[in-house]
Amino acid sequence: AQNITARIGEPLVLKCKGAPKKPPQRLEWKLNTGRTEAWKVLSPQGGGPWDSVARVLPNGSLFLPAVGIQDEGIFRCQAMNRNGKETKSNYRVRVYQIPGKPEIVDSASELTAGVPNKVGTCVSEGSYPAGTLSWHLDGKPLVPNEKGVSVKEQTRRHPETGLFTLQSELMVTPARGGDPRPTFSCSFSPGLPRHRALRTAPIQPRVWEPVPLEEVQLVVEPEGGAVAPGGTVTLTCEVPAQPSPQIHWMKDGVPLPLPPSPVLILPEIGPQDQGTYSCVATHSSHGPQESRAVSISIIEPGEEGPTAGSVGGSGLGTLA
């Protein structure tokens, strides 16, 4: 069978080889398509309800005024010329529709390095057959499930037209110290060959480098956190990030009811002040980061100062 590719909504003419150019003609067209269950026979003198879909022209060709999805299938013509010689024509018709240019919607203006981020959703509407969407980074194809790349795809079919809408959501984990302005684009590749891909306009989100967790430093004076009763302990939370984050304090895993401050002073230490302290830095652009914990303990007279004391009460300190 000869393969024919036709665009949905366009007319199509299939020639009946060997047919006399004018009536009277002895010919018959047989269709096996989405509109038929077995073979439907159309003849030159046929004229009827099928004419809106397919009709035999005076020259014996079959005319489809506007090809639809249901016209995919096999078309056969059997013709006899004036001398009684029989000729058969056999066509396999496939249809296609090119969608509108794909678009990236819900695109991110900023990505955070080292964590998964949604870049955007690529949408293509009105294709047939469905086709595929693929993502590109700086012009090179992105492979899902490789190097922190993941793609969520969805295909929907319009209940009336039968055309497809494709959606593809891209998630990436940018490498620390990588390109600060990567270029992402998405392209639609048609399901039928010989049609070029359609590409979206590119997007260029900024990549923001967060302050690593280990950079929240907790400095304690005196060093080691062991102090004589009535002494003073100063805890300082150092975060080099700009702008300066809000610093909150924790004791024994419970937030202290104090206003934010980078310095916590524990004057006139008593048994109630003993415990494990840490600070939590909260950045406006991402989640909280906690420092290492330090243990504050009281040295009784005559004891050697330990580097870490035992956990104690629940006294409150003052802020610098």
Epitope: E37, K40, G48, P49
Partner: antibody
Framework: EVQLVESGGGLVQPGGSLRLSCAAS????????MTWVRQAPGKGLEWVAS????????YYPDSVKDRFTISRDNAKNSLYLQMNSLRAEDTAVYYC????????????WGQGTLVTVSS | DIQMTQSPSSLSASVGDRVTITCRAS??????VNWFQQKPGKAPRRLIY???NLADGVPSRFSGSRSGTDFTLTISSLQPEDFATYYC?????????FGGGTKVEIK
Amino acid sequence: EVQLVESGGGLVQPGGSLRLSCAASGFTFNNYWMTWVRQAPGKGLEWVASIDNSGDNTYYPDSVKDRFTISRDNAKNSLYLQMNSLRAEDTAVYYCARGGDILVGLDYWGQGTLVTVSS
Amino acid sequence: DIQMTQSPSSLSASVGDRVTITCRASQDVGIYVNWFQQKPGKAPRRLIYRATNLADGVPSRFSGSRSGTDFTLTISSLQPEDFATYYCLEFDEHPLTFGGGTKVEIK
């Protein structure tokens, strides 16, 4: 909302002529085939004529061929049936309906107009 | 020409009954059959299109089925407003042919 309104029916003598009209609204008229169907008093439904969306092709049963002519004016969203050489057996309610091809069959119908052929 | 033989020509039934009406085509018409309901003095109303599909706004108690050239309209539970005349139509070939009709009356 799809609406089809027939007019032009009435009493006519055998051998006479009558022209029926159907005003269509609520849909893109030139996208659809259109059809006339009739129903004699107390009888069933009978197909009378169909026309394709462009108006280039018309279709009739043998019972009315060469006497009736279906036509359309897509600019006016109107369908017509010119009936000549009328006979007593043409007495019926004439309905205008949307469709007539395999894509639609017949979906929406007008309320009908009565044609009486009698001397 | 294709004949559409509709049976029964009339039937009596009660509210709540299951009603079945059949049309047999004299040759293959594929899926190209519609079913209509007509009440006295009114235009026909399409119930089923392409043999098995329920038209918009038609209650789900109506259904259509097909086996070869036999087409069936079923009303699963007859309601007072369903007493009417029902017609099938083949639209695969010209002349378009209607069945003779089935009058559904109150028992």
